[in-house]
Interface confidence: low
């Protein structure tokens, strides 16, 4: 890792599958930090402005995106699982934060979801449909 | 750890940003099940990790697969692992 070759991560949060919510009454958010080098990152989940540890599982170490390359960039994934009712509460705000060299990259689900009519409303009813 | 009532499933997730990454979540599987790495260099699969929902006294195994390939599908994401055929839950179609 020379001083010029430092790549910060791209961070993205993926929302729970409606199928999972219907099937299990639980909701798993996935955070991906990708394309970073070197492999020095710290990932954390924040719910309503507070860091959470319960329901969180993060890869123990980053994954080489191209294992054959000595200087491959890295990726890291993390899951946050909450109850379906907690996920469907539009007041709840979820954020994945990745610290890299002291810089902070993050992605989040904010409070702009419409309040669902029923507990099993589809993601599209929250204004998330790509249309 | 011992997972009570394993209920293995693969779910497709959607990103909050308009990106071309597809993510598949393999979850709630028994601890004896191993997750194999992908033979496709464009498909990334994590090792399994354990998640503990302490407030619900519930633990679950999970692994994540993702790719930027346009033809990447959750039905084939974990094809190198031994997963029952009834494990895959398709995402609901958009009603727009």
């Amino acid at each position: 890792e020379d001083l010029k070759k430092v790549f910060p991560p791209k961070v993205a949060v993926f929302e729970p599958s409606e199928a999972e919510i219907s099937h299990t009454q639980k909701a798993t958010l996935v955070c991906l930090a990708t394309g970073f080098y070197p492999d020095h990152v710290e990932l954390s989940w924040w719910v309503n402005g507070k860091e959470v540890h319960s329901g969180v599982s993060t890869d123990p170490q980053p994954l080489k995106e191209q294992p054959a390359l000595e200087d491959s960039r890295y990726s890291l994934s993390s899951r946050l699982r909450v109850s379906a009712t907690f996920w469907h509460n539009p007041r709840n705000h979820f954020r994945c934060q990745v610290q890299f060299y002291g810089l902070s990259e993050d992605d989040e689900w904010t409070e702009d979801r419409d309040k669902p009519i029923t507990q099993k409303i589809s993601a599209e009813a929250w204004g998330r449909a790509d249309c | 750890p011992y997972i009570q009532n394993p209920d293995p499933a693969v779910y497709q997730l959607r990103g909050s940003k308009s990106n071309d990454t597809s993510v598949c979540l393999f979850t709630d599987f028994d601890s004896v099940m191993n997750v194999s790495q992908s033979k496709d260099s464009d498909v990334h699969i994590t090792d399994k990790t354990v998640l503990d929902m302490r407030s619900m006294d519930f633990k679950s195994n999970g692994a994540v697969a993702w790719s930027n390939k346009s033809d990447f599908a959750c039905t084939s994401a974990f094809k190198d692992s031994v997963i029952p055929a009834d494990t895959f839950f398709p995402s609901p179609e958009s009603s727009c």
Epitope: P38, H40, V41, Q61, Q99 | -
Partner: nanobody
């Protein structure tokens, strides 16, 4: 705050060996990355070697096969074993640590290595 103190520099003949040490004032589990860098007179600072999560190591081309980076967690110390030293290895050698504690990026004051006959 993390402080890094390097030692082990000195004057050595070509072909000789030196072992540099870098002691961190903070517990090693709070540090995800150690690196050794060097700066020769009139040149830019350059990477020599680093060791990071999972004890993965990486070396500059000029260090491969001659230098070895390692760490001893019980002593909060990272080492750079330098063998087959050459005159062009003469430089001020710096230790670097990336920490979980603000401000994250720490450098030592450096230890001078001179390779001369």
């Amino acid at each position: 705050e993390v402080q890094l103190v390097e030692s082990g520099g000195g004057v050595v003949q070509p072909g000789g060996s030196l072992r540099l040490s870098c002691v961190a004032s903070w517990e090693v589990h709070q540090i995800n990355f150690y690196g050794w860098y060097r700066q020769a007179p009139g040149k830019e600072r350059e990477k020599v070697a680093h060791i990071s999560i999972g004890d993965q190591t990486d070396y500059a081309d000029s260090a491969k096969g001659r230098f070895t980076i390692s760490r001893d967690e019980s002593k909060n110390t990272v080492y750079l074993q330098m063998n087959s030293l050459r005159p062009e290895d003469t430089a001020l050698y710096y230790c670097r640590a990336l920490s979980r504690i603000w401000p994250y990026d720490y450098w030592g004051q450096g230890t001078l290595v001179t390779v001369s006959s």
